[in-house]
């Protein structure tokens, strides 16, 4: 399993949508005792290690898991919609959080992590992550813009 | 492996202030994990108190906030809890526990300690 | 905050039965994790995010639902199984919250 971010950055004015995507590739796990818990939240960049810290999105954790007797289980703990936000995941691995009308308190440090549990213990720990600046209206871009990452930081960090 | 101790006094006056320490061996607190109290009364059941995270940023229960500060003391590794203005509402067992950021469950805990406020 | 309920406040069942413990939360959740807790004992994690078994808890504890209906299944009541039985959330945060517990009796 691998976790991985097709842009690095997202450039939005002040009220646009954007949606954030990590990419989760399981080809070695498709078929096996494997399930997984995603979830998306704000962090920082640390000296250390990104993604570390936590911080609630909109005051909305979010809690989504493929849990294979529950293929269908979308845990949230209430409705996203409520808080400006869409989280969604598709059969392509495409793990994604959609921000409505942005402001510039929403700008930061954006991590998607996933969580392989086998037989009840969780494997490993994977984070994608992404920057979103929102700027404001005057001068800037009518929509927002988003930028592949460098080579070195197109894979996601892992932490077992 | 990791063990938490809560220690602190087992009475304490109306109005005083309620100071509990829990001493973490086995791991180091500023490594990861959020670090919590807890509270058990007999009334109330389990109420979560507050924590401390990894790096050193705290959250309280909204119904406790104004009466709580978790502080720690990295050097001896440990972490604290003051409840100031206490009443015989908050006589209760104290517990220190550990929790990873995520899924966010309570993986390690002391044994707790029992305070009792009364005059 | 969300209000976690449990049902029913105590439970005595005999050894080999199975028991059913049910929480139910205020509003839609994510994940629920259970504890056992013992007379004079802390708290030990049973399960976590709803259906996954802590550090060394045998298979006949199981967990399931979602949303606002969560229930803990112990298959096979063994003696020592009984404790008061919690379970927690921490979707709505803060306050972190747990359920008023569940007394179970093995008799």
């Known amino acids: 399993i691998k976790v991985t971010t097709p842009y690095s950055l997202y450039v939005c004015p002040e009220g646009q949508n954007v949606t954030l995507t990590c990419r989760i590739l399981d080809s070695v796990s498709k078929g096996h005792d494997a399930n997984f818990l995603k979830t998306w939240f704000l962090s920082s960049r640390g000296e250390v290690q990104v993604c570390k810290e936590h911080r609630p999105i909109r005051n909305f954790i979010s809690h989504h898991q493929h849990h294979r007797s529950h293929p269908a289980v979308n845990a949230s703990h209430d409705q996203p919609q409520k808080h400006g936000l869409e989280i969604a995941y598709d059969n392509h691995g495409n793990f994604s959080i959609t921000l409505h009308n942005v402001t510039l308190s929403d700008s930061g440090l954006y991590c998607c992590l996933v969580i392989e549990v086998k037989h009840h213990h969780p494997e490993r720990r994977l984070y994608g992550y992404m920057e979103l600046q929102v700027q404001t209206g005057k001068g800037s871009a009518s929509t927002c813009t988003a930028y592949p990452p460098n080579e070195q930081d197109s894979d996601s960090i892992t932490a077992a | 492996q990791v063990q938490l101790q809560e220690s602190g006094p087992g009475l304490v006056k109306p109005s005083d202030t309620l100071s509990l320490t829990c001493t973490v061996s086995?791991?180091?607190?500023?490594?990861?994990?959020?670090w919590n109290w807890i509270r058990q009364t007999p009334g109330k059941g389990l109420e979560w108190i507050g924590h401390?995270?990894?790096?050193?940023?705290?959250s309280y229960n909204p119904s406790l906030r104004s009466r709580v500060t978790i502080s720690r003391d990295t050097s001896k590794n440990q972490f604290s809890l003051k409840l100031s203005s206490v009443t015989a509402a908050d006589t209760a067992t104290y517990s220190c526990a550990r929790a990873l950021y995520y899924p966010w469950y309570f993986d390690v805990w002391g044994t707790g300690t029992t305070v009792t406020v009364s005059s | 905050e969300i209000v976690l309920t449990q049902s029913p406040a105590t439970l005595s069942l005999s050894p080999g039965e199975r028991a059913t413990l049910s929480c139910r939360a205020s509003?839609?959740?994510?994940?629920i994790h259970w504890y056992q807790q013992k007379p004079g004992q802390a708290p030990r994690p049973l399960i976590y995010?709803?259906?996954y078994r802590a550090t060394g808890i045998p298979a006949r504890f199981s967990g399931s639902g979602s949303g606002t209906d969560n229930t803990l299944t112990i298959s096979s009541l063994e003696p020592e199984d009984s404790a008061v039985y919690y379970c927690q959330q921490w979707s709505s945060y803060p306050p972190i919250t747990f359920g008023g517990g569940t007394k179970l009796e093995v008799k």
């Open positions: 509003s839609s959740v994510g994940y």
């Open positions: 401390i995270t990894y790096s050193g940023s705290v």
């Open positions: 995010a709803t259906y």
């Open positions: 086995g791991y180091s607190i500023t490594s990861d994990y959020t």
